[in-house]
């Protein structure tokens, strides 16, 4: 427990004095926070926070569910923990299975244990499919499993936590990675056309077509040397997993002469930005 | 770099026990992946356990569990295997590896980036 000189504050003081309890299901958790400015305990697992203002936390039937960190806190904000596994041997597993990814980035897949002294926690493909060889992860038993740099390659990837108990494989519910693309080049874009000659009065419309992995890329189409909003429509499909296109359709229903000039269509996203032009040229009408 | 030490290997009778250590030195802060293999000659690498530094998660395959135990001593940087109960089968240059973080595949040697030079144990009957 934490010792701190005398005058300065010092963080509550937990019985009993130490940072992971294991109970079995069923049995009592009696928590007791000793501090002169107590203010509350907090319970945290997952998304779940609740919180107890009596300075002894008591769950008289202790259930899986009740795994999770209990943090007592006093009046000068300082806090103490004791992380509690309510060992079920129904219920290995405490999970969330919302489980997005970004490309390169780490992903942690919701499982903590309730029970800390199971053995071969790790990830399973669903229905004995292999995992990618190139995945690694990192184990937590409070908090899951930390897939290391995700891969594009690994969207939709179906999965199990698992873990060893009396020699046999347990798995847990089933979780569908979802990997948002990193941006790893720039937008192509491409114009319908490259140059219009018109009438005074005639239709001016333009399609610039926007490719990339995913939707969040940034488009407009901008008239060089002005600030004026111009009127878009857009079109857009995914066609499969990382093939975003946009379809962004200019148009200016009756062309006037001060119209003509040069229409820029841009798109930029994290990587970097690209355009493409094109070259109004309206006449008037003799 | 990271540089791997085992030590305690030897010759023991059948039914003996023995302790192995791996100490690590070097960038060992971020590597969280440590195992044990074997290698008998003539043979395959062979995954004997593994341990998780942050979190203490243990791997072992079936053969194994019950006789062998991993552990580790985290103010030492080393990991331990506890061998009992030791059969002539078990002979074997037993290696420590390490890496960032465990592959899908945790049995498979060929995914471990970092290595001792081993130590032999000899079960003699």
């Known amino acids: 427990q934490p010792s701190v000189s005398p005058g300065e504050p010092s963080p509550p003081s937990i019985h009993p004095g130490k940072s992971d309890l294991i109970v079995r299901v069923g049995d009592e958790i009696r928590l007791l926070c000793t501090d002169p400015g107590f203010v509350k305990w907090t319970f945290e697992i997952l998304d779940e926070t609740n919180e107890n203002k009596q300075n002894e936390w008591i769950t008289e039937k202790a259930e899986a569910t009740n795994t999770g960190k209990y943090t007592c806190t006093n009046k000068h904000g300082l806090s103490n923990s004791i992380y509690v596994f309510v060992r079920d041997p129904a219920k290995l597993f405490l999970v969330d299975r919302s489980l997005y990814g970004k490309e390169d980035n780490d992903t942690l897949v919701r499982c903590p244990l309730t029970d800390p002294e199971v053995t071969n926690y790790s990830l399973k493909g669903c229905q004995g499919k292999p995992l990618p060889k190139d995945l690694r992860f990192i184990p937590d038993p409070k908090a899951g499993i930390m897939i290391k740099s995700v891969k594009r390659a690994y969207h939709r990837l179906c999965l199990h936590c698992s873990v060893d108990q009396e020699g046999k494989s347990v798995l847990s519910e089933k979780f569908i990675l979802k990997v948002r693309p990193a941006f790893k080049a720039v937008p192509v874009v491409s114009v319908s056309k490259a140059s219009y000659l018109l009438r005074e009065g005639e239709e001016f419309t333009v399609t610039c077509t926007i490719k990339d992995v995913s939707s969040s890329v940034y488009s407009t189409w901008k008239r060089e040397n002005s600030q004026t909003k111009l009127q878009e429509k857009y079109n857009s499909w995914h066609h499969g997993d990382f093939n975003y296109e946009r379809q962004a359709t200019l148009t200016i229903s009756s062309a006037r002469v001060n119209d003509s000039g040069v229409f820029m269509c841009y798109a930029n996203n994290t990587f970097g930005s690209a355009n493409v032009t094109t070259t109004l040229e309206v006449v008037d009408k003799g | 770099e990271v540089q791997l030490v085992e030590s305690g290997g030897g010759l023991v009778r059948a039914g003996g026990s023995l302790r192995l250590s791996c100490a690590a030195s070097?960038?060992?802060?971020?590597?969280?992946?440590r195992a044990w293999f074997r290698q008998a000659p003539g043979k395959e690498r062979e995954f004997v356990a593994a341990?998780?530094?942050?979190?203490?998660?243990?791997y072992y395959p079936n053969s194994m569990k019950g006789r062998f135990t991993i552990s580790r001593d985290n103010a030492k940087n080393t990991v331990y295997l506890q061998m009992n109960s030791l059969k002539p089968e078990d002979t074997a240059v037993y290696y420590c590896?390490?890496?960032?973080?465990?592959?899908?595949?945790?049995?498979?040697?060929?995914?471990?980036?970092?290595w001792g030079q081993g130590t032999l144990v000899t079960v003699s009957s």
């Open positions: 070097g960038r060992t802060f971020t590597y969280d992946a």
């Open positions: 590896a390490a890496d960032e973080s465990f592959p899908a595949y945790y049995s498979d040697y060929a995914l471990y980036r970092y």
């Open positions: 341990i998780s530094w942050s979190g203490g998660s243990t």
